[in-house]
């Protein structure tokens, strides 16, 4: 179904790896496609076959050398081709000229961790993974701590424009048990996007000492 | 914003050749991946051939590889369908399509955002 809208997505987490999702309405689930990737510069090339994520979209992730080795930099451009296969023969779905570096996503940040709390405040750390020496310090999180009885849709984004890997969380309520995620984003690249969301963290607020509060 | 104007269309015989130029206004072009699509009298548009932003990559109808060629000048904010050994099941309207920046070309015409008014071309037997 060549006439079906189709979208192939790729994003590159700053370090070794190379995300992609290719969509195309009223594709089989079975067909077999694969992302090849061909950089201008360097000597390599990379391939990763696409699997089903849903009904007409696929992904997978071109691993181009160890997690925190730099296999790219803002100068390389990266010629992604999807292949899908259509019998004996192998047919070209779509092409792109892909600069790493303005499409960046990175990876989750990890290694959430609560350093202290009290009755109305917690103060939470985590760290960045698998994100390029090149950013240095340029760098924006953001947060969010999801409070009893709501979801994580209604709780307000809290916004740190700078590489702050630590947060103070304040006004909570004694005794309480919430959950607390943060994402990361560089602010370079014209089309990067926000990290996924880290696993949650857990945590209760001590209780509030009798006779007070 | 991405403006395309397509020329070079024309009647020629079967066995020759035509090369159509689109002429695309923007400052982004230089890094669009461009297209060209085809309509036929009482047929849907279908995706012909289309190129990278460097010119890298290109990627063809299995209808016309081999005989068309797909290319781009960007200093001139131009892209051109050489057309040779035409045939007159060729004959169509030809149209160039501009991906959003940052966007894959495709097969699909949903993949383009912006559109020339198209060029005729007539191959007579």
């Known amino acids: 179904a060549v006439n079906g809208t189709s979208r192939f997505t790729c994003f590159y987490n700053s370090r070794a790896n190379i995300s992609c999702v290719w969509s195309q309405d009223g594709a089989l689930q079975d067909t077999s496609c694969q992302v090849h990737a061909w950089p201008d510069r360097r000597r390599w090339n990379q391939t990763c076959e696409l699997l089903p994520v849903s009904q007409a979209s696929w992904a997978c992730n071109l691993i181009l050398g160890t997690p925190d080795s730099q296999k790219l930099t803002a100068v390389d451009i990266v010629t992604l081709r999807v292949m899908c296969r259509e019998g004996v023969r192998w047919r070209m779905m779509a092409i792109q000229d892909f600069k790493p570096f303005e499409n960046l996503r990175l990876m989750a940040p990890i290694s959430l961790q609560v350093v202290h709390v009290e009755t109305h405040r917690c103060n939470i750390s985590w760290k960045i993974s698998q994100a390029s020496h090149y950013f240095e310090r340029h760098l924006e999180f953001e947060a969010r701590t999801l409070s009893p009885g709501h979801t994580w849709e209604e709780a307000p984004l809290m916004t740190l424009k700078q590489k702050q890997e630590w947060i103070c969380l304040e006004t909570l309520t004694p005794d309480t048990q919430y959950e607390f995620q943060v994402r990361v984003k560089p602010l370079q690249g014209e089309f990067t996007t926000w990290s996924p969301w880290s696993q949650p963290l857990a945590f209760r607020t001590k209780p509030a000492a009798l006779g007070k509060d | 914003e991405v403006q395309l104007v397509e020329s070079g269309g024309g009647l020629v015989q079967a066995g020759g050749s035509l090369r159509l130029s689109c002429a695309a206004s923007g400052r982004t072009f230089s890094t669009t991946e461009m297209g060209w699509f085809r309509q036929a009298p009482g047929k849907e548009r279908e995706f012909v051939a289309a190129?990278?932003?460097?010119?890298?990559?290109?990627m063809y109808a299995e209808s016309v590889e081999g005989r068309f060629t797909i290319s781009r000048e960007n200093a001139k904010n131009m892209v051109y369908l050489q057309m040779n050994s035409l045939k007159p099941e060729d004959t169509a309207i030809y149209y160039c399509?501009?991906?959003?920046?940052?966007?894959?070309?495709?097969?699909?015409?949903?993949?383009?955002?912006?559109w020339g008014q198209g060029t005729q071309v007539t191959v007579s037997s």
């Open positions: 190129i990278t932003w460097t010119g890298r990559g290109t």
């Open positions: 399509a501009a991906a959003r920046r940052g966007r894959a070309a495709v097969r699909s015409e949903g993949g383009y955002d912006f």
